[in-house]
């Protein structure tokens, strides 16, 4: 997912609804005007705000990268939700890109978890049941399996 950016405030177009701030804040889906006296609606599909705020601009909507699918579009109150395509996943420690899931487990291990958009396949040792550390095995060690079916 591209890093969340912020859209500069633009002059209110005629279709942008205005209301007054409440306790100095504007509701989700709005930002405060440059003089602090009005709430201006975010532009659907372009920017958004999720909380009560006194931001002078709305947050720019995320665009899903290639290799991602759009689960839900950006609205004035919620950012776009992107997900890795089938067969790829996004790790917590490297959220900026989708990585290919491994096709199988190393020799002596069995698959106990499938590839999901947020996790690689999970392998455990046949005997001990302990999880594999996650490094990709050498090709000759790999026991292949099609996604969703356990390794033999």
């Amino acid at each position: 997912i591209t890093q969340q950016d912020l859209a500069p405030q633009q002059r209110a177009a005629p279709q942008q609804k205005r209301s007054s701030p409440s306790e100095g804040l504007c509701p989700p889906g709005h930002h405060i005007s440059e003089d602090g006296r009005d709430c201006i609606s975010c532009k659907y599909g372009q920017d958004y705000s999720t909380h009560w705020n006194d931001l002078l601009f709305c947050l720019r909507c995320t665009r899903c990268d290639s290799g991602e699918v759009e689960l839900s579009p950006c609205t004035t109150t919620r950012n776009t939700v992107c997900q890795c395509e089938e067969g790829t996943f996004r790790e917590e420690d490297s959220p900026e890109m989708c990585r290919k899931c491994r096709t199988g487990c190393p020799r002596g291990m069995v698959k106990v978890g499938d590839c999901t958009p947020w996790s690689d396949i999970e392998c455990v040792h046949k005997e001990s049941g302990t999880k594999h550390s996650g490094e990709v095995p050498a090709v000759e060690e790999t026991v292949t399996s099609s996604p969703g079916t356990p390794a033999s």
Epitope: P8, D54, L56
Partner: antibody, heavy 117, light 110 residues
Framework: EVQLVETGGGLIQPGGSLRLSCAAS????????MIWVRQAPGKGLEYIGF???????YYADSAKGRFTISRDNSKNTLYLQMNSLRAEDTAVYYC???????????WGRGTLVTVSS | DIQMTQSPSSLSASVGDRVTITCRAS??????LSWYQQKPGKAPKRLIY???TLASGVPSRFSGSGSGTDFTLTISSLQPEDAATYYC????????????FGGGTKVEIK
Amino acid sequence: EVQLVETGGGLIQPGGSLRLSCAASGFTVSRYAMIWVRQAPGKGLEYIGFITSDGSTYYADSAKGRFTISRDNSKNTLYLQMNSLRAEDTAVYYCARYTYSDGTDLWGRGTLVTVSS
Amino acid sequence: DIQMTQSPSSLSASVGDRVTITCRASQSISTYLSWYQQKPGKAPKRLIYKASTLASGVPSRFSGSGSGTDFTLTISSLQPEDAATYYCQPNSGIATYGAAFGGGTKVEIK
């Protein structure tokens, strides 16, 4: 002339309370957001909190619970009530007019608060 | 909260030199940043707002630029009266994120 004048500073013992005043002239405080900023000796500017034109108040984490911002529209004056004062609260306290996109466009000259036994 | 990181913390330059001070925000603030000048024993004075708009009465040798997270204050030809400390401050989301000033840059004349 458009100006802000802070008063109420002085020497106060630790644990004591003090109320600073900021008298505005040339404009109406209730039509603007107003902020308080302080500066410890030899240090940088520290934001304390602000009051919006509708009277809502917001504070920096360091000021929550001990400091209270208010205003008296009839006197065109802003206040900063400071309780449970500590030595580290020793600073020059400034009030200023905050204009959202245009920043803090008008500052008072400041009042010195010294917390010491 | 938004954190503002200013650099350098101090500098020494000669009259006529071009001086550049930078300010980085911990998250994007579009162009909603102000710069202030403070001389010893005096209150701060606004120099620039909306990143690049010169405040009334400020000499044209001062200029500001930047957007998003990275901003610059430039003094095109340093004058003796420019010896002061300079601060940046975000102006969007003061209630939402606070309004922490940058740590300041002290400019001295060689």
